[in-house]
């Protein structure tokens, strides 16, 4: 099949006092193999600090995966989440607030 | 092979500004974080900042915030550093580098001399 | 600010010998941000080790890293030639970051 670009979603949540939990979600993207990643100041945060989500079909021919990861509050602007998917590759910023969410489509 | 070509030695009176180039190349211009040092004359390393070119966003070292301003040009795969209200304090070499997978500085450019002399 | 000590400023050594450099830090950090660069006179810097104790593409082995929380250790087993120069530790755990003074290894 042709490529399909991912779409990526960063969600927060409150955590423990004083921490939050960061979500990047990507999905309806094919083929399967995909780069998703949480960075610290551009640098990629070691693994033993995320949680990755299996690759998985999402029903429509194409598949979904997510990573997390727990940073301090207030910090949020250190950290994004980078994609790398069939030779493209996007990064994406935390959202200010618990009500925003940011979809974006990569071509 | 990923190299960061720098601008050349520039010679400023007190109050001016400068301009600092830096073209990476050899991978995505977008895919990695620019961060500027410099390094004073038989000193060490100080971070300026950095700025990620795919979203724009910057980072400031506090002490640099008010005269220093990071730019990147995408069309053109450029970063550059500004730095106004010269003082001879600020006579140094001026790196630009990239963000590495598991460092902040893995490759970095060749250096510019700023002199500050009126 | 989160400052690092580099200790001893200068260290007088001959080819062949061991060096050992520190970094002491002010604060706690995790073994994940604390980095070393090698840089030689009129040179840029250039990765050594990264993440503590992980040589970066094309460091030769005699160069190792150790640490944890505040101290962290560079050591050259067997001192080369090209070996000579200034060497830098580097946090990124907090902003800013920031580097040590730096040790120069100098031929004695």
């Known amino acids: 099949g042709s490529t399909v670009p991912p779409m990526v979603n960063v969600t927060r949540s409150e955590a423990s006092e004083g921490n939050i939990t960061v979500t990047c979600r990507a999905s309806s993207f094919y083929p399967r193999n995909i780069i998703l990643t949480w960075r610290q100041d551009g640098v990629s945060l070691s693994h033993d600090t995320q949680q990755w989500g299996d690759v998985l079909p999402d029903g429509n021919g194409t598949y979904q995966t997510w990573v997390a990861t727990r940073i301090c509050r207030g910090e949020e602007q250190r950290f994004t989440c980078y994609m790398e998917h069939s030779g493209n590759h996007s990064t994406h910023p935390v959202p200010s607030g618990n009500s925003h969410h940011h979809h974006h489509h990569h071509h | 092979e990923i190299q960061l070509v720098q601008s050349g030695a520039e010679v400023k009176k007190p109050g001016a500004s400068v301009k600092v180039s830096c073209k990476p190349s050899?991978?995505?211009?977008?895919?990695?974080?620019i961060y500027w040092v410099r390094q004073a004359p038989g000193q060490g390393l100080e971070w300026i900042g950095y700025?990620?070119?795919?979203?724009?966003?910057?980072i400031y070292n506090q002490q640099f915030k008010d005269r220093a301003t990071l730019t990147v040009d995408k069309s053109t795969s450029t970063a550059y550093l500004e730095l106004s209200s010269l003082r001879s304090e600020d006579t140094a070499v001026y790196y630009c580098?990239?963000?590495?997978?598991?460092?902040?500085?893995?490759?970095w450019g060749q250096g510019t001399l700023v002199t500050v002399s009126s | 600010e989160i400052v690092l000590t580099q200790s001893p400023a200068t260290l007088s050594l001959s080819p062949g010998e061991r060096a050992t450099l520190s970094c002491s830090a002010s604060?706690?950090?995790?073994?994940?941000?604390l980095h070393w660069y090698q840089q030689k006179p009129g040179q840029s810097p250039r990765l050594l080790i990264y993440?503590?104790?992980n040589l970066a593409s094309g460091v030769p082995a005699r160069f190792s890293g150790s640490g944890s929380g505040t101290d962290y250790t560079l050591t050259i087993s067997s001192l080369e030639p090209e070996d000579f120069a200034v060497y830098y530790c580097?946090?990124?755990?907090?902003?800013?970051?920031?580097f040590g003074q730096g040790t120069k290894v100098e031929i004695k």
């Open positions: 580098s990239r963000s590495g997978e598991r460092s902040n500085f893995d490759y």
């Open positions: 050899g991978y995505a211009f977008t895919s990695n974080n």
């Open positions: 993440r503590t104790s």
């Open positions: 700025i990620d070119p795919y979203i724009g966003r910057i």
């Open positions: 604060s706690s950090i995790s073994s994940n941000y």
């Open positions: 580097q946090q990124g755990g907090s902003l800013p970051l920031t």
